[in-house]
């Protein structure tokens, strides 16, 4: 499929101008190429009329031109003093003309309307209102005003003075008489439907003098804005119907077959399945403006997009409308990545999340789609070391492994962590890309103990039990603040006995935290990588009290107590159920938070991406 | 939960200069942003000033730009409000705020947040 994208249809009227702008991926090769505009004749061949070369034709002489924006990567062919004779079906391309790299688009000029003396010409767009003046003279003060339209060579009664409403018109026409002092009546008609456009004569009196005055009705179908954006990107419809609708539901719907347009999302609370996670609509303003994004481009999303006001929430005749022709450009410059992520409850799961590789220094975020109301994305996690408080010692987000790709990790997972996550940066370059994490039947692959309580001024040693399957990555132990995770030392204590069926490859790693202090209470992290791709972690509180008795603390043996979370293994190794914990004062002494902001330094973790479309929290 | 604690109000000229702090205590890791409120005798609370914790951005209310500037200094939890060139229509009680939930809507990448933490407020008073 050519990506080349322009307008399908443009139409004009004799004597005006119009300008057609036609969008390219601005790749370098595609900005500096030629750049064309070419008529297509009847046996297939396409007629160069003007191009970025300098070439003009002669039936283009003096009132066309084409221009170039490789910065935007589109261009723009004018035409002027428009005849019968420009319409036709032409291409605008790049390269050589019978190469493909082009978009076919159809020009219409209609001859001008054929007007009789004194007609004012009223342009109104669809779904808007007109008031057409009618003025009279004194003698036809007292007598019945009326609006007439002509149908073929008949004139059809509208609506007049006595009270009669043609029924095509009921609801939404209403005939006002100026005060005293002003010689003139006006027709208002709101809700313009396509089928109002046409011929009307006002009328002060039925005799032979009456005062009469011709109109000329125009009801334009708004000309759709083009849009051209990434496959995986995200595109933002911006809809500002005015304040008279700034009470009725709006939506934005896409226009299937014929004239059916079926609704994307609504004020009403109504949202296509097949955006489910990937759309927002914002609350609206009180002029009636509103807008939606809408991340993830699918190829299938292409196509004609409207926004309106309607009390039902959808399409109807007379409704105000914007236009949109949306293509998907599939030579996108976004990478793919996993839309689907998988992790067990009680396991952990690690995002990547592309960005524009320039803009290395831009915030990164993460956030929850919530689809409640129209949609919110409430920010769990970002960059510059903020997560979310519910979020504390099981989320991270680190800039590894660069290079155009940051990672997210969260564990302690929950079904409740099941849903839409946006990738984000504040960067120009407006990348959002959407990942559904889903959690699935299964047990964790790395074990550790619950929460353990560290004694002041003694030694900690605290186990992690990696499956076989993790022989061959780099093990690891970190302490969690809210900038990352940090490296510390561990040691690997030989084969683990916490796996069934596992070969001496399972391996058991500890942390040792030697003469704990205060400082060492908070969140540890032990996983897996394979160098800045991070796989499984799992989380263990560490919670310090004062000294009770002497001796060291090695928390790998099961205890008879054990909780009721907790099942005992044959190993001897008690399995925890990591439940996600809101706060660690349910363990520990209240205690003031600090702030771990500037701790910025240090080890910061990543994941195998698994399938192109799919990632599993664990890593296979 | 986040607590705030204002100081630094007081009585001052007009054209005079005051600094008001807010030491912040608790989950201040989930603190998104700060902000200072008002409140004048029988009116609305209304906004004056707001940072991001991590200083990169700050908005101010028309009436307070260019004489009143918002800052933060992270090692000790606190942000100020520098109030220069003082009115007797700045005189009302200035609040503290923290948020904590910022989010998404369409007019990303603009960041939202709603102030859902408040200290008690301290008195600032401005003679003619």
């Known amino acids: 499929k050519s990506p080349i994208f322009g307008p399908e249809e443009v139409n004009s009227v004799e004597g005006n101008s119009v300008s057609i702008t036609c969008y390219y991926p601005p790749t370098s090769v595609n900005r500096h190429t030629r750049k064309y505009w070419c008529r297509q004749g009847a046996r297939g061949g396409c007629i160069t009329l003007i191009s970025s070369e300098g070439y003009v034709s002669s039936k283009y002489a003096g009132r066309a031109n084409l221009t170039n924006f490789p910065e935007n990567g589109t261009f723009v062919v004018n035409i002027a003093q428009l005849s019968q004779d420009d319409s036709g079906r032409y291409k605008c391309g790049l390269g050589i003309n019978s190469r493909g790299l082009s978009f076919d688009v159809s020009l219409e000029v209609s001859q001008g309307p054929g007007l009789l003396n004194d007609t004012k010409v009223y342009t109104v767009d669809l779904g808007r209102t007109v008031t057409i003046n009618c003025p009279f003279k004194t003698e036809n003060a007292q007598k019945r005003k009326s609006l007439y339209k002509q149908i073929g060579l008949y004139p059809v009664l509208v609506i007049d003075s006595s009270g009669y409403v043609n029924p095509n018109y009921t609801g939404r026409i209403r005939l006002d008489i100026q005060g005293t002092g002003q010689l003139l009546f006006s027709v208002v008609i709101n809700q313009l439907r396509l089928s109002d456009a046409g011929q009307y004569l006002c009328q002060a009196g039925d005799d032979s003098n009456s005062n009469k005055k011709n109109a000329d009705l125009q009801v334009l179908k708004p000309e759709p804005e083009l849009v051209y954006e990434d496959l995986r990107g995200s595109v933002t419809f911006h809809c500002a119907l005015g304040p008279e609708v700034a009470n009725v539901a709006k939506f934005l719907c896409r226009q299937s077959s014929g004239e059916n347009c079926d609704v994307v999302v609504n004020t009403l609370g109504k949202r296509a399945p097949a955006f489910e996670g990937r759309i927002l609509l914002n609350p609206q303003d009180k002029d009636g403006s509103f807008s939606v994004v809408i991340t993830g481009l699918r190829k299938e999303d292409a196509g004609r997009y409207l926004c309106g006001a309607h009390s039902d929430g959808q399409l109807q005749e007379g409704s105000p409308i914007q236009a949109w022709q949306l293509f998907v450009n599939e030579e996108s410059t976004i990478p793919r990545s996993p839309t689907v992520v998988k992790g067990v409850a009680g396991g952990s799961v690690a995002v990547l999340c592309p960005y524009n590789r320039k803009e290395s220094k831009s915030i990164k975020y993460w956030c929850l789609w919530e689809g409640a109301q129209n949609g919110r994305c409430p920010l769990l996690v970002d960059s510059e070391g903020w997560v979310k408080a519910q979020y504390e010692g099981r989320l991270s987000l680190l800039e590894e492994p660069g290079n155009g790709t940051f990672t997210v990790i969260l564990n302690q997972l929950t079904s409740r962590d099941a849903g839409f996550y946006w990738c984000l940066t504040n960067g120009d370059t407006l990348w959002r890309t959407t990942v559904e994490i889903k959690i699935i039947e299964g047990e964790p692959n790395l074990k550790v103990p619950g929460n353990v309580t560290a004694v002041l001024g003694e030694t900690l040693k605290v186990p992690c039990h990696f499956p076989c399957k993790f022989s061959s990555y780099e093990k690891y132990w970190c302490k969690w603040n809210n900038t990352g995770c940090q490296a510390l030392p561990s040691q690997d204590e030989g084969p683990s006995k916490a796996f069934v069926n596992c070969d001496e490859n399972s391996r058991l790693v500890s942390l040792t935290l030697n003469l704990v202090t205060r400082a060492d209470e908070g969140w540890y992290w032990c996983g897996v990588k394979q160098g800045h791709f991070y796989g499984e972690t799992a989380a263990v509180y560490v919670a310090v009290e004062e000294r009770k008795a002497a001796g060291s603390r090695d928390v790998s043996l099961a205890k008879a107590d054990a909780a009721p979370d907790e099942k005992v293994l044959d190993s001897g190794f008690r399995e925890i159920e990591n439940k996600a914990i809101q706060d660690p004062r349910l363990f520990a002494e209240e205690k003031a938070v600090a702030d771990t902001r500037d701790q910025a330094d240090g080890s910061r973790a990543s994941v195998d991406s698994g399938s192109s479309e799919e990632q599993g929290g664990s890593s296979r | 939960q986040v607590q705030l604690v204002e100081s630094g109000g007081g009585l001052v000229q007009a054209g005079g200069s005051l600094r008001l702090s807010c030491a912040a205590s608790?989950?201040?890791?989930?603190?998104?942003?700060m902000g200072w409120f008002r409140q004048a005798p029988g009116k609305e609370r209304q906004f004056v000033a707001a940072?991001?914790?991590?200083?990169?951005?700050?908005s101010y209310a028309d009436s307070v730009k260019g004489r009143f500037t918002i800052s933060r200094d992270n090692a000790k939890n606190t942000v100020y409000l520098q109030m220069n060139i003082l009115k007797p229509e700045d005189t009302a009680v200035y609040y503290c705020?923290?948020?904590?939930?910022?989010?998404?809507?369409?007019?990303?990448?603009?960041?939202?947040?709603?102030?859902?933490?408040w200290g008690q407020g301290t008195l600032v008073t401005v003679s003619s």
């Open positions: 705020a923290a948020a904590t939930n910022p989010y998404f809507s369409d007019y990303y990448p603009d960041l939202k947040y709603e102030f859902d933490y």
């Open positions: 608790g989950r201040t890791f989930s603190v998104y942003a």
């Open positions: 940072i991001t914790w991590s200083g990169g951005s700050t």
